[in-house]
Each structure stands twice: as C-alpha cells, then as structure tokens.
C-alpha cells in the first residue's frame, strides 16, 4: 500500500535497512545544493529551519534558484541525465543555486506507490520554498522547478502548495499513467506557476503512454509529434546496447525531453523553434510555420513566457542528437493540372540549394493526397543551415523505385492497359522558412516546361522575394 508518513513526511528507507548502530533516519526528501559540476562532489544538504548550510554553501538569495526533481526510479540511484542537467545549468547560469530534490526512497517503489508519494514530496518542496521566502532578498519569482516524468507532477504539487507563485515550472515529459485526464489539482497544470512550459517526447495512442498526452502547461511542445523520436528506434537502440529491447526505446524517448532541455542550455546559439498547431498531422502538412501572434517559440530554457488564455500546443522536428536544431520549411506547390493520375499518389523528393549548403534529397510527405487545381502544402526540414535558398530540384520517383508503387502501377495497367503517361504541371513553388519567416517564390527554369512525370525532375529558380503578401514577424526571440 502507499508508503505511510509521519507528520514530517519522513520515512525509513525500507529497501536499505539501516545498520543497528544507526539512530538517525534519513529524511525521505532531501535538498542537495549542488556547489560543483562534479557529480562526485557531495554538495550541501539544506533543511527547513537550518540557516547555517545556506551560509556555508554560499546560497545566493538574489540569484535564480533551480530545483531539479527526478521521477520514478527502478534503480534507486540518480541517473546520468540528472548530472548532465546540473552541469548544464551551472554552465549557463553561473551564479544560480542548483538544488537537486532527492526523493529516491519514495520514488524507488512500485510506480503506482511512487505516484501516491508525489503529493507529500510536493509538500516538502513547498515547505522549503516557504521557509526560503522568509529570508531577505529571496524571491519566488526567481524559482524555476524542473521536473522529469513523475517529478513534473511533484513540481505541480509544489507550485500548488507554496504560499505565492513560483516563477516557472518546466515539465520534462510529465508521467502519463494515473495522471492522464486527472483533475488539475492532481497533476501539473498552468496555475501551478507564473509560466509552465512542457516538453512531451513519449506519448502513445497505443500501449501505455509513459508520458502524458494531454496539454498541461501554458505551452506544450511536442517534438517530432511527441511520439517517435529520431535515434530512439529499436534499430538505433539495438546498435548501441546489447539486447536492446523496448524498454531502451521507452527510456530513450522519455528521456529525450531532458536532453532537449540540456541542449537549450548548452547550445544557446542553436535554438530550436516550435510552432503552434492544432495537431501533429496539420504540422506534418507544413501548415503551421507562423510566428505571428506568439505562434512560435524557442523550446527549453530559452522559451519566452506566454500565458495564453487557451493552452498552446506546439510542434517541431529535431535531429537525432545534440544539437537538436533543424531548419523547417513550408513548401506550397500549386498543381494546376493532372493527367492520368490513376490510383497511386506520386512520390516526390526535393533538393534545396542554398548560399551556405545544399540539402540532401528530402521526401515530401503526402499526409492525405495530392489535390489538383489546388495548392498542396508540405513540410520539409534540413539538419544544416542552407543560407538563402537559390534553387529547388523537384523529382518524381519512378514507379520502379518502389515495389509498392510498381505493384499498384501494374494493377493500374491491368485495369486501363492503354493508360498514357501520367504527368502533372507545376509552375511555381512557394517556400517559407520557419526559422527566418522569409517567404520566397521559385519558378520553373523554363516557363514553357512545367510538366513532371515519374522518373523525371523539374528545376525551379528563385524568381521573387515574398509571396506578394505582407511579411510576417521573425521568430528572433530575445534570449533570457
């Protein structure tokens, strides 16, 4: 049953019974002020009512104070991500206080029991914050709680219980089981801090979603749709870990939220931008690359405060590792005539040529279907900064390049043996960069030749800046 507590919320760690000579019971929640980047350095332990450690360990009352809150643990020890986060915070904010909330005895339980312990841990953090507020110069507005997985909900409880309002809570893939659909007072929610930003990296509609799917902050960012993270597939994991299994995939995707946050601290010159969108599918279509009216934001530490009336779901693509930044492009292709399209969707690829670099051949993901006499929108992204775009190569994959298409082509031929060549006509491609918000129009090199068919390519050159529309604001966000 859920772990019992005394009036102080303290508990003997039953997993590691103290030696007979030990009289002092370790508190179940400890506050470790990290005074060094070195994970081997013990730091200082703070406790409510004891001011000496604050002086001994040079706690800076006027500086930012970060509380790092771990989640459920099967191992009962701190994992590597925590040391990386501590180090990154020290690197970025040299004067800040970095406090690790150690609730391992209560987290090193059955997951469900650990969930039932989150409330008391939140209370302990709130008590610590209430005590610190009694000190001169300490401001709750300078407090930033960073909670991973179950720790995100602990942060929510702390923000809810504290006297006043903490400056910021960052939820790093808040835990899903037992919190999905829960009442706002029983999970992380926007009213737990002045600004609540959330990264969702392991959400699933099948199986058990380890990360919470629902939005729980002022901004909720879903990198790569919030589910399949690049570099975390079973094949990727199998390559690096003996007996790679689904648990390694879960850990990789769930923990990706932490690494995205660390990336935002250490690679501040390479910020990743997320874009507001109603859902992942619309984002994949390339519809949502606007920065107007706060519709885009930096992710992680550099996120600018947005307190929307309604929750803001935001999306972005990332690389498989640090630095995670990619460059997003919206491509609008107006197909003005179709010829003998049959039942199969064309498979298009684009190559972008820029002043700094050329992209790899990038697939155009057709989310639904190609519409004729209509503008079709696509999302493409590159890992490198191409600079200013100069030209675009559009290729229609020949049927023989895909077994599935070859089969459909063959079926199409059987039903319509005299079906002449398939083609479609494209005069121009309009491109918008998510990162710079620049709009460009590309026209076919030969105005007389606008048709493309399987196995062929079409070249487009920049023919004008803009889309003959009012320019949108740039996402160049003032970094804190």
């Amino acid at each position: 049953s859920p772990v019992p507590f005394g009036p102080e919320g303290r508990l003997e760690d039953k997993l590691h019974k103290p030696k007979a000579t030990q009289t002092e019971v370790k508190p179940s929640v400890r506050f470790n002020l990290r005074t060094s980047k070195d994970p081997e350095h013990e730091g200082c332990y703070l406790s409510v009512g004891h001011s000496q450690p604050l002086e001994d360990c040079s706690f800076n009352m006027t500086a930012k104070t970060f509380f790092i809150i771990h989640g459920w643990t099967m191992s009962g020890i701190f994992e590597n991500w925590l040391h990386k986060l501590v180090s990154a915070l020290h690197t970025r904010e040299k004067d800040a206080n970095v406090v690790v909330v150690d609730w391992l005895p209560l987290a090193h339980q059955l997951y469900t029991d650990a969930v039932n312990n989150t409330r008391v841990v939140g209370h302990s953090i709130a008590r610590m914050l209430d005590w610190l507020q009694e000190k001169d110069d300490f401001s709750l507005g300078n407090v930033h709680l960073i909670g991973y997985s179950l720790g995100a909900h602990v942060a929510g409880y702390a923000g809810n219980f504290v006297k006043g309002t903490v400056g910021r809570i960052t939820g790093l893939d808040p835990a899903g089981p037992m919190f999905e659909g829960a009442d706002i007072h029983k999970r992380l929610s926007p009213d737990d801090a002045d600004f609540v930003d959330v990264l969702h990296t392991y959400t699933r509609s099948f199986g058990l979603s380890i990360g919470i799917q629902m939005p729980v902050g002022h901004i909720d960012i879903y990198p790569n749709g919030g589910d399949f993270q690049p570099g975390c597939g079973l094949n990727d994991v199998l390559g690096s870990i003996a007996y790679g299994t689904i648990t390694e995939v879960v850990k990789c995707e769930h923990e990706r939220a932490v690494h995205l946050f660390v990336d935002s601290l250490v690679n501040q010159d390479k910020p990743s931008f997320a874009f507001q969108c109603t859902d992942s599918n619309r984002f994949k279509k390339g519809i949502c690359l606007s920065c107007r009216k706060n519709r885009c934001n930096s992710i992680g530490y550099n996120a600018k405060k947005m307190r929307n009336k309604r929750n803001s779901k935001m999306y972005l693509k990332t690389r498989a590792g640090m630095p995670f930044r990619v460059y997003h492009y919206q491509m609008k292709i107006h197909v003005f005539s179709y010829k003998n399209m049959g039942e199969i969707e064309p498979t298009f690829y684009v190559t972008l040529y820029g002043t700094n670099a050329d992209s790899q051949t990038l697939p155009l993901e057709i989310v639904e279907r190609i519409e004729q006499n209509a503008t079709n929108t696509f999302l493409v992204y590159t890992e490198e900064d191409l600079g200013d775009l100069l030209k675009i190569q559009l290729t229609w994959e020949g049927a023989s390049q895909s077994w599935y298409n070859l089969w459909k082509e063959f079926r199409s031929y059987l039903s319509q043996p005299r079906n002449p060549g398939r083609e479609l006509n494209i005069r121009r491609i309009r491109v918008k960069s998510g990162e710079t918000q620049r709009k460009l129009t590309f026209c076919t090199e030969d105005p007389e030749n606008t048709s493309i068919s399987p196995g062929r390519e079409l070249w487009f050159r920049k023919c004008r800046d803009g889309w003959r529309m009012k320019n949108e604001t740039s996402p160049t966000v003032e970094l804190p």
Partner: antibody, heavy 119, light 107 residues
C-alpha cells in the same frame, strides 16, 4: 527473444532448505525486475517478492519474508530464491517472471519449478 | 492487501462462443489490472495489461475492459487453444495479488 529458464524439480525433506534458480536471456539482465510467484496444486497464484539486479533491491510479500531469500549472480544472469524451514505447505510450483515497468505486469514467465516437501 | 475475486471458478462454452470472465478488486486499482492465461501444461502467458492493452503476439479476439474495481476479459470467438485457466492480477500496490482463476472448458 526473452527467456527465463528455471531449474528442475526438487524433492526435499521437511525442515530442509532448497535453492531454485531462474536464468535470464535475450535482454539486458540488470534493467528488469524478476518476480517469484507460488502456485499450490490446483490453486491460485501468490506473489512472493521481487529482485532488481540493477541495484540489488528486494521487496518481499510480508507473508514470505521469513520463508524466501532472493539473490542474484549477475555474471551468470541468474536470480535465485532460497526457501528455508520447508513444510508441506511449501509444496508448490514456483515461477519466476519478468516485470514490465509502468504497467506492473509480468510479461514473460519461466516454465516453473515443482518443489515437493515430503519425509 | 487488495483482494481479487473471480466469482466464476469454472466456465463451459462452445467453440466460436463469446466468453466473458470477470474480476473484482476490493478497492479501486486505477486500471492496473492484468490478465494471464495458464495452459493445461502449466505455461503462463500475459494476455492483457493495464486493463485493455493487448500484449504483443496475443490474438485480437482477446480484449479487456473495466475501471475502478470491476474488470473483465472477453474472448470474442472461442478457439480450442483458448481452453485454459485465466487469472487476473492487480499491479496497483504491493503485495501484488491474483484472482483465484477461472477454468475455461469446452461444453
């Protein structure tokens, strides 16, 4: 694929002890908890306890804490359960099974070891 | 400890039938309910975890539902290989506890 191979049947005398083994293969041994479950003839299942090789942490069902002792040998990827002071009540099939995190289910089971306590 | 009750200890059905086995917990277990199949040779397999999620490799004729304290396992189209004993288990809190089992046989 994931496999849990249990040791063979045991016939033991009352008051004696017995050590059962469960050898794991097909996954990272230190990343999953191994549970032990008891099934008396024609009856239901009873959870005995767990052993987590990643940190050697152990949890027992209060009912079995003076009966079972769980240990492991990481080098051979094997978890052991020693049953002491055996009585006829301990005659049963004992299963080891692997815990799935978050779902709190036992996704893979050994074939079971029959322990018969008889004079 | 949480008590798990499978009221029906034995159930007869014909091949092709839709069969439902129920399980009740003595308190709310927040969907942490798993179903296992024990075949006549003693082999135990996980069928359903977290109330309704199908374990990999389990045929889609098996499904689970429920919430709070009441849960059920349904086999939509009974096949010969489904003749076995079915156990429910709560994973909500320690000690984990199992239902007494429901033995499914052919009419």
């Amino acid at each position: 694929q994931v496999q849990l191979q249990q040791s063979g049947a045991e016939l033991v005398k009352p008051g004696a002890s017995v050590r059962l083994s469960c050898k794991a293969s097909g996954y990272t041994f230190t990343k999953y908890t191994i549970h032990w479950v008891k099934q008396r003839s024609g009856q239901g299942l009873e959870w005995i306890g767990w052993f987590y090789p990643g940190s050697d942490s152990i949890k027992y069902n209060e009912k079995f804490k003076d009966k079972a002792t769980l240990t492991a040998d990481k080098s051979s990827r094997t978890v052991y359960m020693e049953l002491s002071r055996l009585t006829s009540e301990d005659s049963a099939v004992y299963f080891c099974a692997r815990h799935e995190e978050y779902t709190n289910s036992l996704a893979y089971w050994g074939q079971g070891t029959l322990v018969t306590v008889s004079a | 400890d949480i008590q798990m009750t499978q009221t029906t200890s034995s159930l007869s059905a014909s091949l092709g039938d839709r069969v439902t086995i129920s399980c009740r917990a003595s308190q709310d277990i927040s969907n942490y309910l798993n179903w296992y199949q024990q075949q006549p040779d003693g082999t135990v397999k996980l069928l359903i975890y977290y109330t309704s999620r199908l374990h990999s490799g389990v045929p889609s004729r098996f499904s689970g539902s429920g919430s709070g304290t009441d849960y059920s396992l349904t086999i939509s189209n009974l096949e010969q290989e489904d003749i076995a004993t079915y156990f429910c288990q709560q994973g909500y809190t320690l000690p984990w506890t199992f239902g007494g089992g429901t033995n499914l046989e052919i009419k």
